[in-house]
């Protein structure tokens, strides 16, 4: 694959008249602070982009902030300031994009020493704002409920939790003390109280509450409460343990109504829970390891969300700054990379494929060495920069990326070797869902996937000099053109297209810098006039998923089916456009005892497929069995893995026990079985809004 | 010339034996799985059994399990089946069949076929 | 098992007509079906796979579509030597199953 434009990318010579007749330059005149984009709507062309500058005096902060539309993809904007009466805008809140593609806005002001606060709402995809005064102060970003972009919630900086559905005309306090508040499904919210001093103080008393219609009625889900979470169709509590300092998980399916125990260990005081991915099959639970190690326990769950088996060990999560690099691989079903810490502290990145039922290291890429990290200059793996990289100031300037709709194509920043380097790291594509990498660009770069995968577009990363030159890719990274977007070189900040990678633009940010000041300026490239042709049928070929070898008749069989794919040939060069939908087939695989998890009080020896009885039961295994409910402790010892869809070969159907028998123990009383079973739990979940660019969805 | 060439068939009573062999030239046989597929007089083609390239992968219809057998040998450029227990049902035309080398692929290459009567 | 149920059974059809067979798969197969042609005592050749792929060397006029489990071979202006047995096949599940098979005889 050639990194430079040479004979084999010849294709992608004289691009640059092409482009440079649909390069487009914003100046924005106003005092460089910090800038927040966000599309409003899908398809629509409309940007909106916030600066703000703000200067710390004495007690207080001044600050301006300017906001700018754009309705052509950021090619052009128009000072809209006026709109929003000159006021400063909380660019901690950021800009408040409504769900789905309802047009709605909602920016707050901060309105400093009230009581008070105003926010700014737009219905028409920012065309127009009207303000609001609000009878509270916000304590985070305004939520929409998913379902009903009217309808909002407000967190007050005095725990009040706030309720309007009218999109923020009237407002009516639904409740005091509140710590944290979540939209459940339809008209339904989530939330926590103290009854005592603050939500720190009450942490581990508090109590879960549900409304179903909005504020009218409340009903207690939950006590003894530390935290809560929502994950695909589970609600997950950490409820404290009567006779310690501990707390365990239990989960709901059925919004709070009956809650189970889930069968996982129990954490102290300076452990933590996280969900790191849920669907409505199951889910990825992280679980601390005590003391300050960095590093915990990945389970995966049944389609009950009660009983677990351990997926991967030594995951690296830091209980200090609450970084992992779980990531979901989104552009294939069932992948997901994250990083174990090994027992010599070196860090390495691991790769499931079957949705965490087994866990490999990465294909070393063919067309690269193994670095000093390798003790075998001959065997290594690749390993992968994400959130802890980055969090760790490497010179790593973006996470991995995928989309749904560019199949197979993973990007990410990574080194050759036995353990991730500090180094300064390449970026490297798989076009399999990572299964194969090859080298792409050297060196670190900013990348975004345009045109569902048909365009890819990269800048390298360059601290200290100015950029001028954007790298484009037709073929998922084999051949890269180069276009100078500009005679003087910017500050790069960053790539920005449309959510989505449906787009065929990119706007570069950066600033430019003179002796009195410096100013931000975007740069927006429309391809269009590059790949002109719309794809046809002859462009596509068929790929089938997952496939590893295709001798074999369960090729690509993963979690019970297989699916071919329609994919762009790499040597098309043609639009894939705006409304592409990805042509996916799947069929059914026959059962193998691989789509079966071994039920709780099972286990699978080593290199055996059966599950086997558990000769004793220990642990957190025993406190399950004690206070789970009767009905989990019935099992044929097997259960279907969430979301496998085989039918026929293997039945492993065999003689139901009842483990009930199996529950004895000296230290746990038999007598609080009942009062358990069926009790109420909950949790108050979240010192983790910061997780959402990472897409955990749950912290505690 | 890429050439599948059968043989080995013939008259049996039924519950006799019968070795087919299936000789490849042209092309490189250690990369291929390759497939036996029957057709009984005046009916429908019926797959019969498949073998991968290195043998780790054979796979039979049900009609014939436990009573043939697929093999092969690269270094011979040769794919046989040995059928035992044959059966009145068995008579039919045995072709030999190179499958295509992507996933799930087609027979592309299919030799002339032979003969195999079973009857008393 | 997947059924694979070809139709018509048989054709008869003038030189220069379009004929068309279709092939129901009893469950999705994705695009793992494919197409041979099989004159009278001789062996069958491949003309279309995985669906809708053309064969090396296959005429033009032979062309294949569907997905799932509704396929049809399509061709376009019979000729004379087009005279024989189709038979549709599906490689996605063992085991390994043919169409019944559609006899095209010339008018």
């Known amino acids: 694959r050639s990194t430079e434009q040479g004979e084999s990318c010849s294709g992608l010579l004289g691009a640059d008249a092409k482009l440079a007749g649909n390069t487009h330059q914003h100046i924005f005149n106003d005092l460089s602070g910090s800038v927040s984009l966000a599309w409003v709507g899908d398809g629509t062309g409309v940007i909106l982009a916030l600066t703000t500058f703000q200067v710390p005096i004495f007690m207080i902060t001044i600050g301006q902030s300017k906001l700018y539309r754009s309705e052509d993809y950021g090619k052009s904007f128009e000072d809209v300031t006026n709109l929003i009466n000159n006021t400063f805008i909380r660019s901690d809140f950021g800009i408040a994009i409504g769900p789905e593609n309802s047009g709605k806005v909602i920016l707050t002001a901060d309105v400093s020493g009230s009581h008070g606060s105003r926010i700014f709402v737009s219905s028409d995809f920012g065309k127009s704002f009207t303000h609001q005064e609000l009878p509270f102060v916000p304590l985070m970003q305004i939520t929409y409920n998913p379902e009903n972009s009217n309808v909002l919630l407000a967190l007050s900086n005095k725990n009040e939790l706030w309720l309007s559905e009218d999109f923020g005309t009237n407002w009516k306090k639904l409740y005091d003390a509140v710590c944290l508040a979540k939209w459940g499904s339809d008209n339904t919210i989530f939330f926590t109280t103290y009854a005592n001093g603050s939500c720190k103080a009450d942490l581990g008393a508090l109590e879960l509450w549900r409304t179903s219609d909005l504020g009218k009625s409340f009903k207690t889900i939950g006590v003894k409460i530390y935290s809560f979470g929502l994950g695909g169709r589970f609600l997950f509590a950490s409820v404290m343990a009567d006779k310690d300092t501990t707390r365990r998980i239990h989960v709901s399916t059925d919004q709070g109504d009956t809650w189970s125990m889930a069968q996982l260990p129990s954490v102290g005081q300076e452990q933590f829970y996280s969900i790191l991915a849920a669907n409505d099959d199951m889910v990825f639970m992280h679980v601390d390891e005590p003391g300050d190690t960095g590093f915990g326990t990945i389970f995966t769950s049944d389609d009950r969300g009660i009983v677990y088996s351990k997926s991967l060990d030594r995951h690296l999560y830091t209980t200090t700054g609450g970084e992992t690099d779980f990531t979901n691989v989104t552009s294939l079903r069932g992948v997901y990379i994250t990083s174990v810490l090994s027992e010599d502290n070196s860090i390495q990145t691991m790769i499931t494929f079957d949705q965490g039922g087994r866990w490999t290291h990465l294909r070393k890429p063919e067309n690269s060495e193994c670095d000093a990290t390798a003790k075998n200059k001959n065997e290594c793996s690749l390993h992968i920069h994400a959130s802890y990289s980055i969090s760790q100031k490497l010179n790593v300037p973006m996470a991995p990326l995928s989309e749904p709709n560019a199949v197979g194509i993973v990007i990410a920043h990574g080194s050759v070797g036995d353990a991730i380097s500090v180094m300064v790291p390449d970026v490297y594509i798989s076009d399999d869902g990572g299964y194969s990498w090859t080298k792409m660009l050297e060196g670190p770069h900013h990348y975004a996937i345009l045109d569902s995968g048909g365009l890819l577009v990269a800048v390298e990363q360059n601290a200290h000099q100015g950029v001028n030159q954007i790298k484009f890719s037709t073929d998922e990274g084999q051949c890269w053109g180069v276009y100078n977007f500009t005679k003087d070189p910017i500050f790069f900040t960053g790539l920005a297209s449309e959510p989505g990678a449906r787009s065929m633009n990119v706007s570069l940010w950066g600033y430019r810098s003179s002796l009195f000041h410096q100013y931000w300026i975007s740069f927006t490239i429309d391809f269009r006039d590059l790949i002109t042709r719309n794809c046809e049928e002859k462009d596509y070929t068929i790929w089938l998923a997952h496939s590893t070898d295709p001798e074999d008749y369960e090729d690509g069989c993963i979690l019970g089916y297989k699916e071919q794919f329609l994919r762009l040939r790499k040597s098309s060069v043609c639009q894939n456009g705006r409304d592409y939908v990805v042509t996916k087939q799947p069929s059914i695989c026959l059962c193998s005892l691989e789509d079966f998890l071994c039920d709780f009080g099972y286990y699978r020896p080593e290199n055996d497929s059966k599950c086997v009885e558990q000769p004793e039961l220990k642990g957190h295994d025993l406190e399950f069995c004690l206070y789970g409910r009767e009905e989990h402790l019935t099992t044929n010892g097997y259960r279907k893995i969430p979301g496998d869809k085989c039918q026929g070969g293997v039945n492993p159907v065999r003689e139901v026990k009842d483990l009930k028998k199996k529950c004895t123990s000296n230290f746990l009383s038999p007598e609080k079985q009942n009062s358990k079973s069926n009790g109420s739990a909950g949790g108050s979940g979240g010192l983790n809004d910061i997780f959402e660019a990472q897409k955990i969805e749950w912290h505690e | 010339e890429v050439q599948l060439v059968e043989s080995g068939g013939g008259l049996v009573k039924p519950g006799g034996s019968l070795r087919l062999s299936c000789a490849a030239s042209?092309?490189?046989?250690?990369?291929?799985?390759m497939n036996w597929v029957r057709q009984a007089p005046g009916k429908g083609l019926e797959w019969v059994s498949s073998i991968s390239s290195s043998s780790s992968y054979i796979y039979y219809a049900d009609s014939v399990k436990g009573r043939f057998t697929i093999s092969r040998d690269n270094a011979k450029n040769s794919l046989y089946l040995q059928m035992n227990s044959l059966r009145a049902e068995d008579t039919a035309v045995y072709y030999c069949a190179r499958r295509g080398s992507g996933s799930y692929d087609a027979f592309d290459i299919w030799g002339q076929g032979t003969m195999v009567t079973v009857s008393s | 098992e997947i059924v694979l149920t070809q139709s018509p059974d048989f054709q008869s059809v003038t030189p220069k007509e379009k004929v068309t067979i279709t092939c129901r798969a009893s469950?999705?197969?994705?695009?793992?079906l494919h197409w041979y042609q099989q004159k009278p005592d001789q062996s069958p050749k491949l003309l279309i796979k995985?669906?809708?792929q053309s064969f090396s060397g296959v005429p033009s006029r032979f062309s294949g579509s569907g997905s799932g489990t509704d396929f049809t071979l399509t061709i376009n202006s019979l000729e004379a030597e087009d005279a024989a047995a189709y038979y549709c096949h599906q490689s996605s599940s063992l085991p390994l199953t043919f169409g019944g098979g559609t006899k095209v005889e010339i008018k």
């Open positions: 042209g092309f490189t046989f250690s990369s291929y799985s």
């Open positions: 995985y669906a809708s």
């Open positions: 469950q999705s197969i994705g695009y793992s």
